[in-house]
């Protein structure tokens, strides 16, 4: 048993039929000695009397708030949760699991840029009694501060007869160093509360192997005299670091004509501008990335052609 | 570069960014695999990393691009040393067009640039044996060459904007 | 789910020579490691030998077939192979085509994998 935040604690359980559970002592919070009851939750059903109560928590039905009080008046509470582990892993009931970018991947995290700032995100098909706590840190012998803000429902998308909910969290580096070579990764735990179930889910990462730029911005087409040809130019997104001479971005460009089959053709370049043959009907493209780390992609940025 | 001439700014940009390129091709990213499976992180640590106080920032570049030059040279040394090692010459075998050899002879084009013959900066303490099973070796070039992208992307990003703001 | 389908396996005298293939389903290929195992009735499963593209690229092989054994790999027709010549005797064995995808072949020099086939018989008659 350990203390997750003033009185509320976390009973570890080995999981399985028939499983010996853990035996916790409870005290009661006050200098009284004498005429002391306990309580588990709203039943009025008296547990046991003393200062300290012995239990062994085997099952849901054993957590809960457990409640001291003497002459009909409560003293003191202490909650329990339940966090599980079967076969000897803990267990993930309350998050989805995202499977990208591979299997177990329960918290998923991006950055626009190098400023150490950045945006996680998890799913869970649970609507009610949930509550979320983030922690981040750089490191994790030596942390250095990293502060999260509070958890926001950032969207709820319909899965055939499900519901899901996706749930994000914005994190900044205390002492962020855009220009420096990442030598600790960071680190983000998210304790989930799911009724009397705890759970903790943890992602470690360095901001270079998260970075996904925004789109390019400012897509212009300028037809040239006499050609079939365009001038294509865009710009850096401004979410992106600065300066761009040292924060470079290199692109990927491509003209998709009406019918999805079409052959596209893909030209990289690490310019803002470019001419290519641009049908009518068609539409041109422009996806950016890290010119020296090959991080994720931005999504595509799109103009039509005609 | 030693004393305070400056490096050949677009020749260090064109071959940073070759060594970029040649870092990801000898070790592509896939998304799946995360090195901190396999345990022991640290393993990695004693490579030589560009810092905060370095001085290859944009505004550290402008003061004085001396410090951040001397640094990325080491870190030069240091990882062509490794690559010419025992980790990448012993078990198992590099496949017979595999990259690492012209990354290993583009490291040491690039420490050069740095330093024409003549002038000589310390350079760091070279790394320990390395490890005796094949399968051990293997995930230390991992380690090495995820490590050397994350340090060359730097290098690279100084000498571009070396070559865009401080050149003759 | 990767699918590894062998084929090549047979009977030969000892001092010939054998071709196996083996076919992946997925395009996960290149960023697998591929490798072969063999197992003999009654023995411990054998490392035989692998191929990578992480880590500047590798190829490896067991004591017992180095030398003689060679693996390659077709990217793009996700197949690898493994040419056996000088066979021996102590050679026959079920001959199986692995795949280790999470951790591009460290696991396959460990002696284990993410994926296996069916295997194929080889039987080296002297």
């Known amino acids: 048993i350990w203390e997750l935040k003033k009185d509320v604690y976390v009973v570890e359980l080995d999981w399985y039929p028939d499983a010996p559970g853990e035996m916790v002592v409870l005290t009661c919070d006050t200098p009284e000695e004498d005429g002391i009851t306990w309580t588990l939750d709203q039943s009025g059903e008296v547990l046991g009397s003393g200062k300290t109560l012995t239990i062994q928590v085997k099952e849901f039905g054993d957590a809960g708030q457990y409640t001291c009080h003497k002459g009909g008046e409560a003293l003191s509470h202490s909650l329990l949760l339940l966090h599980k582990k079967e076969d000897g892993i803990w267990s993930t009931d309350v998050l989805k699991d995202q499977k990208e970018p591979k299997n177990k991947t329960f918290l998923r995290c991006e950055a626009k840029n190098y400023s150490g700032r950045f945006t996680c995100w998890w799913l869970t098909t649970i609507s009610t009694d949930l509550t979320f706590s983030v922690k981040s840190s750089r490191g994790s012998s030596n942390p250095q501060g990293v502060t999260c803000g509070a958890v926001t429902l950032s969207a709820e998308r319909v899965r055939g007869d499900n519901k899901e909910y996706e749930y994000s969290v914005e994190c900044q580096e205390d002492s962020a160093c855009p220009a420096a070579e990442e030598r600790l990764p960071i680190e983000v735990m998210v304790d989930a509360i799911h009724k009397l179930k705890y759970e903790n889910y943890t992602s470690s990462f360095f901001i270079r192997d998260i970075i996904k730029p925004d789109p390019p911005k400012n897509l212009q087409l300028k037809p040239l005299k006499n050609s079939r040809q365009v001038e294509v130019s865009w710009e850096y997104p401004d979410t992106w670091s600065t300066p761009h001479s040292y924060f470079s971005l290199t692109f990927c460009i491509q003209v998709q004509g009406k019918s999805k089959r079409e052959k596209k053709d893909r030209i990289f370049t690490d310019k803002t501008s470019a001419t290519v043959i641009c049908r009518k009907n068609a539409s041109f493209s422009v996806q950016a990335q890290d010119r020296y780390y090959s991080s994720s992609w931005s999504e595509w940025a799109s103009v039509p052609c005609s | 570069v030693p004393g305070g001439s400056s490096p050949a700014w677009a020749q260090c940009q064109q071959l940073s960014q070759k060594l970029c390129t040649l870092a990801w091709s000898a070790h592509p990213l896939v998304g799946h695999m995360d090195l901190r499976e396999e345990g022991d992180e640290e393993t990695t640590n004693d490579v030589p990393h560009i810092q905060c106080g370095d001085g290859c920032d944009p505004q550290g570049l402008r003061d004085n691009s001396q410090f951040c030059l001397q640094r990325i040279r080491q870190g030069l040394i240091f990882y062509e040393k490794l690559l010419g090692s025992d980790i990448f010459t012993g078990e198992p075998s590099l496949l017979p067009d595999s990259p690492v050899g012209q990354l290993h002879a583009s490291l040491l084009g690039l420490s050069q640039l740095l330093q024409p013959e003549g002038h000589h900066w310390e350079t760091q303490q070279i790394p320990s044996p390395s490890p005796s099973q094949p399968w051990q070796r293997l995930l230390l070039r991992f380690k090495i060459l995820r490590s050397l992208q994350a340090f060359v992307a730097v290098a690279a990003r100084v000498f571009a904007h070396g070559a865009a703001t401080l050149s003759p | 789910e990767v699918q590894l389908v062998e084929s090549g396996g047979g009977l030969v005298q000892a001092g010939g020579s054998l071709r196996l293939s083996c076919v992946a389903s997925e395009r996960t290929f290149s960023s697998s490691a591929m490798g072969w195992f063999r197992q003999a009735p009654g023995k411990e499963r054998e490392f035989v030998a692998a191929?990578?593209?992480?880590?500047?690229?590798?190829?490896h092989y067991g004591d017992s077939v180095k030398g003689r054994f060679t693996i390659s790999a077709d990217n793009g027709k996700n197949t690898v192979y493994l040419q056996m010549n000088s066979l021996k005797p102590e050679d026959t064995a079920v001959y199986y085509c692995?795949?280790?995808?999470?951790?591009?072949?460290?696991?396959?020099?460990?002696?284990?994998?993410?994926?296996r086939g069916q295997g194929t018989q080889v039987t080296v008659s002297s």
């Open positions: 692995a795949a280790d995808s999470r951790l591009r072949g460290i696991a396959l020099l460990k002696g284990s994998y993410d994926y």
């Open positions: 191929i990578g593209w992480s880590g500047g690229g590798f190829i």
